[in-house]
Interface confidence: low
């Protein structure tokens, strides 16, 4: 009993003075609590509590259930307590069959003991089975036994107190373990798409599947650099024991252009935290960009192939789409694809091939596209460059001789003579008149050179060579001459084509 | 000063075992996760091991499950790496890391300077 | 595990601004961080999260998170940026980390 110094309050005085009683069942409990300040009694076990005013508590019958603490407190908040045990040997045990632990923590599975002299006093898994060999625990007689450091593999895990009785093994009735996860990990957050794009009035709806080991992970929906809180709505499952799954999903009816902007998905729990964003992009009308993926004015040489490509984006997606040239449209020779199969892909690709292009097909490509909302188009001019072709080569009335060549780019002539029998031409010849001439072809087409010199100059036998040339190569046209006495005399011109 | 010093490495023959040592200074050693991350010559970096603070938490890289065992001694602000049955591909230079979470970031933020292992017969 | 994709190797011209650019699937739910490495050195943080700079890093550099896409950004390079460069992220699974196989970038 507690020793009193004056002028102090000192915590009541209990009979029988001891810390622990037992009693047997149908025996009667007597507890006489002496303080002049005495306020009340107070019984306790498991979650049960009971409360008597009068200084003297008396059970005639005692029972198992009146196992427990019993407390006598004064008015100045000090108290002293006894423990009675009511030995009942049909019933060891009294019990609270709820059983919860949370992860890396310690759990009590609360049998307390009507008999403080039973041995053995344990936990035996349910119909035989061994318990988890990792599994430690700490009985006391008073409050239960206490598993230390509960482990996930413990869940749903089937449980009996256990005692020693004259010999025999007596068991609680059973209890289930239901283990609490720790967060050992950030949550796992995705999201359905990582942009949108809608026009004004469309619908905007996103969901964020948030993964964790239980419920409590808490999570939301935000708006990058706001606090208004978004409507959500939540369906959630549970994969099993440690896999949960939510669903948060956001939708905004009619979305108008400010509603623009990035959403984050956030979640957290007691490890950390995780997030995902998602751009929403609302415009007032569908649009169509045209980027050439190459200059839009090509130079390309005769016979070979030239690809005309482009990459467009649309929204709504495109519907028509046409090559066009010289009011002709293409209907094979090109293709248009997506240029990634996501399906928020607005960016796509058109190419039309051109193959073994002659000197004729220069001329405006166009690429036209439409969706429902606008019309786009883009031109390519194509020039095909072609080595050039002597097209005449003429001694003129007036002694002139005159060449005239075609070709893209324009080709320059230059005139040499070979004087007497020399197969090599070097001396040059400066022309008296060039002029380029208007072409009837189209407007892309080979550009015409007209040269012209006088023949009066030479006074030897020999040849003339013109000699047309540009970027892709080069040709020559030879005219032969020879004087007859005091007459010259023309010899029919030949073109000798080098290479 | 803040350091992390790997030590252990060297020249075993496939199917042999190293214990690689890794000591920390300069911090609160045991609140911080920590990693093992190696570079194979001439190659890039790959994540091998990663254990939390409390050594409750430990993942590998598929490469090394079953083979490597990482572990800590926050009394000796030390990390190991215990590498079994070790094959001709995991010879790299192992970098210990510090490895941590802000806000949700992961990155590592405290390399040492590493320590070669050599597998070849 | 999901891997991260980079560029071998990258050459920007002295002061001029060049991109280095991760992809992966992991990359769509996790942030990427960045690290450079230089011969015979051990890596250095220079980028995490939302474009989060480490104290001690230039102010030229800068990151950048699209999609299933990560970029780190060198504005007005030096001759000292001269590096290997790794970005690196949780692995979808979200209990490995995952390396991209680096980008050599040179400094002309």
């Known amino acids: 009993q507690p020793s009193v110094s004056p002028g102090e309050p000192s915590p009541p005085s209990i009979h029988p003075g001891k810390s622990d009683l037992i009693v047997r069942v149908g025996d009667e409990i007597r507890l006489l609590c002496t303080d002049p300040g005495f306020v009340k009694w107070t019984f306790e076990i498991l979650d049960e509590t009971n409360e008597n005013k009068q200084n003297e508590w008396i059970t005639e019958k005692a029972e198992a259930t009146n196992t427990g603490k019993y407390t006598c407190t004064n008015k100045h908040g000090l108290s002293n307590s006894i423990y009675v045990f009511v030995r009942d040997p049909a019933k060891l045990f009294l019990v609270d069959r709820s059983l919860y632990g949370k992860e890396d923590n310690d759990t009590l599975v609360r049998c307390p003991l009507t008999d403080p002299e039973v041995t053995n006093y344990s936990l035996k898994g349910c119909q035989g089975k061994p318990l988890p060999k990792d599994l430690r625990f700490i009985p006391d007689p008073k409050a239960g036994i206490m598993i230390k450091s509960v482990k996930r593999a413990y869940h749903r895990l089937c449980l009996h107190c256990s005692v020693d009785q004259e010999g025999k093994s007596v068991l609680s009735e059973k209890f289930i373990l239901k283990v609490r996860p720790a967060f050992k990990a950030v949550p796992v957050v995705s999201v359905s798409k990582a942009s949108y794009l809608l026009r004004e009035g469309e619908e905007f709806t996103v969901t964020c599947t948030i993964k964790d080991v239980s419920s409590s992970v808490y999570s939301t929906w935000k708006r990058e650099n706001s606090q208004t809180k978004l409507q959500e709505k939540y369906n959630s499952w549970h994969h099993g024991d440690f896999n949960y799954e939510r669903q948060a999903t956001l939708t905004i009816s009619s979305a108008r252009v400010n509603d623009s902007g990035v959403f984050m998905c956030y979640a957290n729990n007691t490890f950390g935290s995780a997030n995902v964003t998602t751009t929403l992009e609302v415009v007032d009308k569908g649009f169509i960009n045209i980027f050439p993926m190459i200059n839009t004015t090509v130079f390309v040489n005769d016979g070979e192939n030239v690809d005309l490509i482009v990459e467009y984006e649309a929204f709504p997606k495109p519907e028509h789409q046409q090559w066009i040239y010289m009011n002709r449209t293409f209907t094979d020779k090109w293709e248009d694809y997506p240029k990634s199969e996501n399906e928020s892909n607005i960016r796509y690709v058109s190419e039309l091939h051109l193959t073994r292009l002659k000197g004729t097909e220069g001329g405006t490509y166009t690429f036209l596209v439409s969706n429902s909302d606008v019309n786009a188009a883009i031109a390519f001019n194509v020039y095909v460059n072609t080595k050039p072709e002597i097209l005449t080569y003429d001694r003129l009335v007036n002694g002139m001789l005159q060449c005239v060549a075609a070709g893209f780019p324009e080709p320059t002539i230059d005139w040499y003579f070979c004087p007497g029998t020399e197969q090599r031409c070097s001396a040059s010849v400066l022309p008296v008149d060039v002029q380029t001439l208007n072409s009837s072809g189209p407007p892309f087409g080979k550009l015409v050179v007209q040269s012209s010199i006088d023949s009066s100059a030479f006074k030897h036998n020999g040849t003339v060579e013109c000699k047309a040339y540009n970027d892709v190569g080069k040709t020559s046209a030879y005219f032969n001459f020879a004087f007859k006495g005091n007459n010259k005399e023309q010899i029919h011109p030949h073109t000798l084509f080098t290479p | 000063q803040v350091k992390l010093q790997e030590s252990g490495g060297g020249l075993v023959q496939p199917g042999g075992s190293l214990r690689l040592s890794c000591a920390a200074s300069?911090?609160?050693?045991?609140?911080?996760?920590m990693s093992w991350v190696r570079q194979a010559p001439g190659k890039g970096l790959e994540w091998v091991s990663y254990?939390?603070?409390?050594?409750?938490?430990?993942y590998y890289v598929d490469s090394v499950k079953g083979r490597f065992t990482i572990s800590r001694d926050n009394a000796k602000n030390s990390l190991y790496l215990q590498m079994n049955s070790l094959r001709d591909e995991d010879t790299a230079v192992y970098y210990c890391?510090?490895?941590?979470?802000?806000?949700?970031?992961?990155?590592?933020?405290?390399w040492g300077r590493g320590t070669l292992v050599t597998v070849s017969s | 595990q999901s891997a991260l994709t980079q560029d071998p190797a990258v050459s920007v011209a002295l002061g001029q601004t060049v991109r280095i650019t991760c992809q992966g699937d992991?990359?769509?739910?996790?942030?990427a961080s960045w690290y450079q490495q230089k011969p015979g050195q051990a890596p250095l943080l220079v980028m995490y999260?939302?474009?989060i700079r480490p104290s001690g890093i230039p102010d030229r550099f800068s990151g950048s998170s699209s999609g299933n896409s990560a970029s780190l950004t060198i504005t007005g390079a030096q001759a000292e940026d001269e590096a290997d460069y790794y970005c690196?992220?949780?692995?979808?699974?979200?209990?490995?980390?995952?390396f991209g196989g680096g980008t050599k970038l040179t400094v002309l």
């Open positions: 890391a510090r490895l941590r979470n802000s806000e949700g970031y992961w990155y590592f933020d405290l």
């Open positions: 300069g911090f609160t050693f045991d609140s911080y996760a």
């Open positions: 254990i939390t603070s409390s050594s409750s938490t430990i």
């Open positions: 992991s990359l769509r739910s996790y942030f």
């Open positions: 999260g939302q474009n």
């Open positions: 690196n992220s949780r692995d979808s699974s979200y209990n490995h980390w995952v």
